[in-house]
Interface confidence: medium
Amino acid sequence: KSSNEATNITPKHNMKAFLDELKAENIKKFLYNFTQIPHLAGTEQNFQLAKQIQSQWKEFGLDSVELAHYDVLLSYPNKTHPNYISIINEDGNEIFNTSLFEPPPPGYENVSDIVPPFSAFSPQGMPEGDLVYVNYARTEDFFKLERDMKINCSGKIVIARYGKVFRGNKVKNAQLAGAKGVILYSDPADYFAPGVKSYPDGWNLPGGGVQRGNILNLNGAGDPLTPGYPANEYAYRRGIAEAVGLPSIPVHPIGYYDAQKLLEKMGGSAPPDSSWRGSLKVPYNVGPGFTGNFSTQKVKMHIHSTNEVTRIYNVIGTLRGAVEPDRYVILGGHRDSWVFGGIDPQSGAAVVHEIVRSFGTLKKEGWRPRRTILFASWDAEEFGLLGSTEWAEENSRLLQERGVAYINADSSIEGNYTLRVDCTPLMYSLVHNLTKELKSPDEGFEGKSLYESWTKKSPSPEFSGMPRISKLGSGNDFEVFFQRLGIASGRARYTKNWETNKFSGYPLYHSVYETYELVEKFYDPMFKYHLTVAQVRGGMVFELANSIVLPFDCRDYAVVLRKYADKIYSISMKHPQEMKTYSVSFDSLFSAVKNFTEIASKFSERLQDFDKSNPIVLRMMNDQLMFLERAFIDPLGLPDRPFYRHVIYAPSSHNKYAGESFPGIYDALFDIESKVDPSKAWGEVKRQIYVAAFTVQAAAETLSEVA
């Protein structure tokens, strides 16, 4: 068979057939099935769900479905010794205690094994002291406190509101500031949208609701005890003192009812400006300590959680490719949840389930994709992306040689306003072309394309008539594939209107109130947004696995490289005198970007013209496209972050969720004016420019004619 025929594509067995097979009603049923009990990582319930998914994927028609298990470090509250925070008087008596659990939602009162709110991987401890309010505990918040307000957090317990940045960054910042404990809380300003009722009457966070979450700073390491290698049966494990990314001070989350009780007594300095005020009826004083009448009272934390090596299970399904079985397109999302996982992750897992069913249906009718598709149900994502990272560590040699693309499939919705896509620039054209072919589910856009409604509601800030596509950051299972291995990656979900809803994430994120009913009643009663997300994720996988020429456009990388070079150059230009003194030049970077642009343009011309019936030439051109993302990987990694190896993108050092471009240069320049040794600091800037320029040039050369 010629390569054109090999996938047996008849009019029935094409993208349309795949998309038409996806049904909203099935996604709804799967979501219900996945959300009736908690599926916390490391528990029997989540193991049983893994086996159920394995069985169903086999029924759907995949060639093989296996469980891949690992023994990783997890963290749980002590069942007999609950975590809480108290206000104590001068005699040490507890005059106020925070709640020990969230009031369960209606219909779930008798469900067992709901883990109470806790900060996963918090060390044990019972620190007591004065409170300091640190706003969102971002880098800039601590700069404001320490440099402008001259407030010292050393030896204090800090209270920070959730939002804006990953909670692990908040804890790291507090540790660096010398705090001896951290209290995290959800402020209504960030988690209560005006005009919407609290759950169960609406999708807002009630006062007793609390956000769970891990507080690690893993920087891509995976299991804290086995960085770089799989946590298998013969693994060598580090001692807990050498574990990667564990916090050193106790941390605990609370809701806004409890936060009110702590914050209403705060004294000391007034908030520096309105951006430090939330929506509670408290002064938002920074402290330290309580005001006059209460100045002898202190805050005490009681944290008794334990870290335990526990078995986790990934489900890995394979649909073998007919022509290029050694080329892998991966669709993966996690299965473990903090409690019921109504949105995170099961709205995503239900979509993956339906995508697998649709692919299976086509396979049963005699169709196969050109390339192999791997489907993954990851475990322990909530504990630091552990399942995906351990599997990728175990299979890294295969993945780096065979991995075409990774599409992530966590929560399908975080709102119901418009599409949100984060991906490698290589996938921009794929996403644009696909969404032009899909119908918009949005009201007012009947008969219009998804591309049209998306572009209208979320326009690109740079290119008119195009939608916004964001950089990949982290905080989800694509991390190891993209940031460590350099496999082209993307993610898509439905989101809120960020302009009108300023709260962080969705209000009930990681709370007990994230239920099936939350989705079915308030977010997507018809499951039309879930269906659209299934079409986008599934459509991307279909095209990546089935198109004869990989649907990657290297010219889009050239465009963003120029944009990112301009941006980092502008940041550096804020220090003209130092740039002169230390002879800092960006010429090499701009020259490399120019070369990349020219070579990418020539490669694209060759891609239009080559003989696609010649399987050797076809494979050669596809390999150049597949390996382009890989070419941006620096084997040495970023400074102090060896598992973040992508030179163009990394998670921000100040917010794991956000992506930063040219992160090596960015970090070298960050706060450079405060460095004690400017010569050394600017030397590092120059080194990072050199690394970036070399990498861009080297990547460009992978697109040159091979001989």
């Epitope: 150059y569 502008s570 230009m573 804020k574 740039m579 002169k580 030049s585 960006f586 010429d587 701009f590």
Partner: antibody, heavy 123, light 107 residues
Framework: EVQLLESGGGLVQPGGSLRLSCAAS????????MSWVRQAPGKGLEWVSG????????YYADSVKGRFTISRDNSKNTLYLQMNSLRAEDTAVYYC????????????????WGQGTLVTVSS | DIQMTQSPSSLSASVGDRVTITCRAS??????VNWYQQKPGKAPKLLIY???TLQTGVPSRFSGSGSGTDFTLTISSLQPEDFATYYC?????????FGGGTKVEIK
């Protein structure tokens, strides 16, 4: 003494070519980006072209792109400007200038200038 | 490209006067502006780089200020040898274009 000395100017017909040279002395030539700047009679300064210290990157004004080529020989401490397809509007005094930087991203100004060489394009 | 608009194009002043010349960039250029002095038949001379730093050997009566898009060259007390044409130049990004020049003449 730090010095730049241009040569190669003269009268040339439209469509003709000229090669200007700039000999540098008194400083480490290979550590500085270099530029050519011209000034038409009675007019202001117009930047023409630049080259980084290593010679790895070159830059041109739109008005000369595709016609002029800047180059350097660091072993000879010499900067060149090859001018082809000359036009009447290229008539000017051409200055060679040292950039107080190793590259064009950014430069801290042109701190050493030659005395200039006159190029006249006329039939 | 970044355009540099210099004003005024000429001015008349007396010895001892305070003279101010302004330059506006078409987009923000941090502090990457240089000022040159040119006398008839001579090559330009760098006076100020990076908006406000005096080049070695330049008298302190010359000063520069500004950042972003608006920049100023000031001569605090005009001397006879200061009658010349002054040019601003941006070196934020290529092409490093010059302003149109300001001719300072004797009143």
């Amino acid at each position: 003494e730090v010095q730049l000395l241009e040569s190669g100017g003269g009268l040339v017909q439209p469509g003709g070519s000229l090669r200007l040279s700039c000999a540098a002395s008194g400083f480490t030539f290979s550590s500085h980006a270099m530029s050519w700047v011209r000034q038409a009679p009675g007019k202001g300064l117009e930047w023409v072209s630049g080259i980084t210290a290593s010679g790895g990157s070159t830059y041109y004004a739109d008005s000369v792109k595709g016609r002029f080529t800047i180059s350097r020989d660091n072993s000879k401490n010499t900067l060149y400007l090859q001018m082809n397809s000359l036009r009447a509007e290229d008539t000017a005094v051409y200055y060679c200038a040292r950039d107080d930087s190793s590259g064009y991203y950014p430069s801290y100004g042109m701190d050493v200038w030659g005395q200039g060489t006159l190029v006249t394009v006329s039939s | 490209d970044i355009q540099m608009t210099q004003s005024p194009s000429s001015l008349s002043a007396s010895v001892g006067d305070r003279v101010t010349i302004t330059c506006r960039a078409s987009q923000s250029i941090s502090t990457f502006v240089n000022w040159y002095q040119q006398k008839p038949g001579k090559a330009p001379k760098l006076l100020i780089y990076a908006a406000s730093t005096l080049q070695t050997g330049v008298p302190s009566r010359f000063s520069g200020s500004g950042s972003g898009t608006d920049f100023t060259l000031t001569i605090s007390s005009l001397q006879p040898e200061d009658f010349a044409t002054y040019y601003c130049q941006q070196t934020y990004s290529p092409p490093p274009d010059f302003g149109g020049g300001t001719k300072v003449e004797i009143k």
